[in-house]
């Protein structure tokens, strides 16, 4: 219909010619092609003042293909995108700006976060983690036996690690002390003779139970194990030797 | 929003005419190649007639052709197919969509029998 | 004019199915195929463009495969909402042209 019309018309042109070349079916010295050869996409490029024709067999990039009965014609995505699939549906968008449902902004819509790597805006995704473990049984450096005081631990997994804008996850431990069960440990769990009978009773304070915090993003947080616990006694014993032997020897030395 | 309704459905005899319109908004409807899609009483699509988004193109099935025209007012956002020479085999709900390769947005339909 | 043949015409599934629906064209029409999906009294709404590419929204349980003549619609674990026609469709050629659809029925 519209199709024979317009060939017509060029063909009747003085400077239409036939002879052309890179995929024109017909051209002029002028406008370069004005029709194209079977599924060449048809683009005007704007050169100075003046606007080519060219035939290509794909779009160039920031338009897409459209194939009419009297011409395949590549049209402008819209300014903000890069690549399209037709006006309404944008696949790729220019520096800036972030994909949503096709359209590109620029900045995401409330309850959506930026990726800025695929530069698109998605859900905010927030920690999730699982139900807490039972509590391990209750221990000294190692053990379960021979001493008054232990720790016990419980942790919980990190299901769903959030997104940038999402919910910090919570403590992925907790440990507590404990009284550990009131037998004596057979010969291979034995450990050094009378230390716990000199151990002073715990501290109210010792008794409450302690909670590790967590890092930003839920990555494991330190807690105290039994073998540091033990080393800090075994510290702060030798501290207080240190300053009976210090007042001993002060006593001692005002006499002379 | 992208909203489409079409309007101007009915009975009417063969031979007569009817004219449909299709009110468009949400959108910048003067960017847009649009089209009138057609579905039969529990039979499949068939698309009608395209208009391109100036309104200098417009292309048609073959059994429509010298007797329906698309045309657009871009100064009213309206879409319009002017139907003539209705024949019984025209009976159908006829849909305004916007057309880009694919038919991405469509109004609710409006449904045209052709019936003595 | 490029004819497009669905296949079956009617199928019957139940929720959880995995249901697959063929789009045969009668000439290469490479990878310029649509699929819609119709409920009963509502417009056709576009589901895949491309072949394979998902309309935002759609859920991923929808897929799209094939190129040339043949191609195929995948839902894989089918969802209450999802009974309804499907329709491909062709825009390498005018007139665009639709299959004749396929109804999705409860088993």
């Known amino acids: 219909q519209n199709a024979s019309r317009g060939r017509r018309q060029r063909r009747m042109h003085p400077n239409v010619s036939q002879g052309c070349q890179g995929g024109c079916a017909t051209c002029s010295d002028y406008n370069g092609c004005l029709s194209c050869k079977p599924r060449l996409f048809f683009v005007l490029e704007r050169i100075g003042m003046k606007q080519i024709g060219v035939c290509l067999s794909s779009c160039p990039s920031g338009y897409y293909g459209t194939r009419y009965p009297d011409i395949n014609k590549c049209t402008k995505c819209k300014v903000d995108c890069d690549t399209c699939f037709n006006k309404n549906f944008c696949t790729k968008c220019k520096s800036g700006f972030y994909l949503h449902l096709g359209k590109c902004l620029d900045s995401c819509p409330e309850g959506l976060e930026a990726n800025n790597h695929t530069m698109e805006c998605v859900s905010i995704v927030h920690c999730e983690a699982s139900e807490w473990s039972p509590w391990s049984p209750c221990m000294k450096k190692g053990k379960t036996c021979g001493f008054k005081r232990g720790t016990e631990t419980r942790v919980r997994d990190i299901l769903q690690h959030p997104s940038a804008k999402g919910n910090l996850c919570p403590p992925t431990s907790e440990t507590r002390t404990c009284i550990v069960q009131r037998k004596k440990c057979s010969k291979g769990e034995r450990g050094k003779k009378g230390r716990e009978r000199k151990r002073k009773k715990l501290n109210k304070e010792e008794r409450k139970e302690t909670s590790s915090s967590s890092d930003s993003k839920g990555l494991e947080s330190s807690i105290e194990t039994p073998d540091q616990q033990e080393n800090k006694e075994r510290q702060q014993q030798q501290k207080r030797r240190a300053r009976d032997k210090q007042q001993k020897s002060v006593s001692v030395s005002t006499v002379h | 929003e992208v909203q489409l309704v079409e309007s101007g459905g009915g009975v009417v005899q063969p031979g007569r005419s009817l004219r449909l319109s299709c009110a468009a908004s949400g959108f910048t409807f003067s960017d847009y190649d649009m089209a009138w899609v057609r579905q039969a009483p529990g039979k499949g699509l068939e698309w009608v007639a395209t208009?391109?988004?100036?309104?200098?193109?417009?292309y048609y099935r073959d059994s429509v052709k010298g007797r329906f025209t698309i045309s657009r007012d871009n100064s009213k956002n309206t879409l319009y197919l002017q139907m003539n020479s209705l024949r019984a085999e025209d009976t159908a709900v006829y849909y305004c969509a916007t057309h880009d390769k694919t038919f991405d947005y469509w109004g609710q339909g409006t449904m045209v029998t052709v019936s003595s | 004019d490029i004819q497009l043949t669905q296949s079956p015409s009617s199928l019957s599934a139940s929720v959880g199915d995995r249901v697959t629906i063929t789009c045969r064209a009668s000439e290469d029409i490479y990878s310029d195929l649509a699929w819609y999906q119709q409920k009963p009294g509502k417009a056709p709404k576009l589901l895949i463009y491309?072949?394979?590419s998902l309309i935002h929204g759609v859920p991923s349980r929808f897929s799209g495969s094939g190129s040339g003549t043949d191609f195929t619609l995948t839902i894989s674990s089918l969802q209450p909402e999802d009974f309804a026609t499907y329709y491909c469709q062709q825009y390498d050629n005018y007139p665009n042209t639709f299959g004749q659809g396929t109804k999705l029925e409860i088993k």
């Open positions: 491309d072949v394979n």
């Open positions: 208009i391109i988004y100036d309104g200098s193109r417009t």
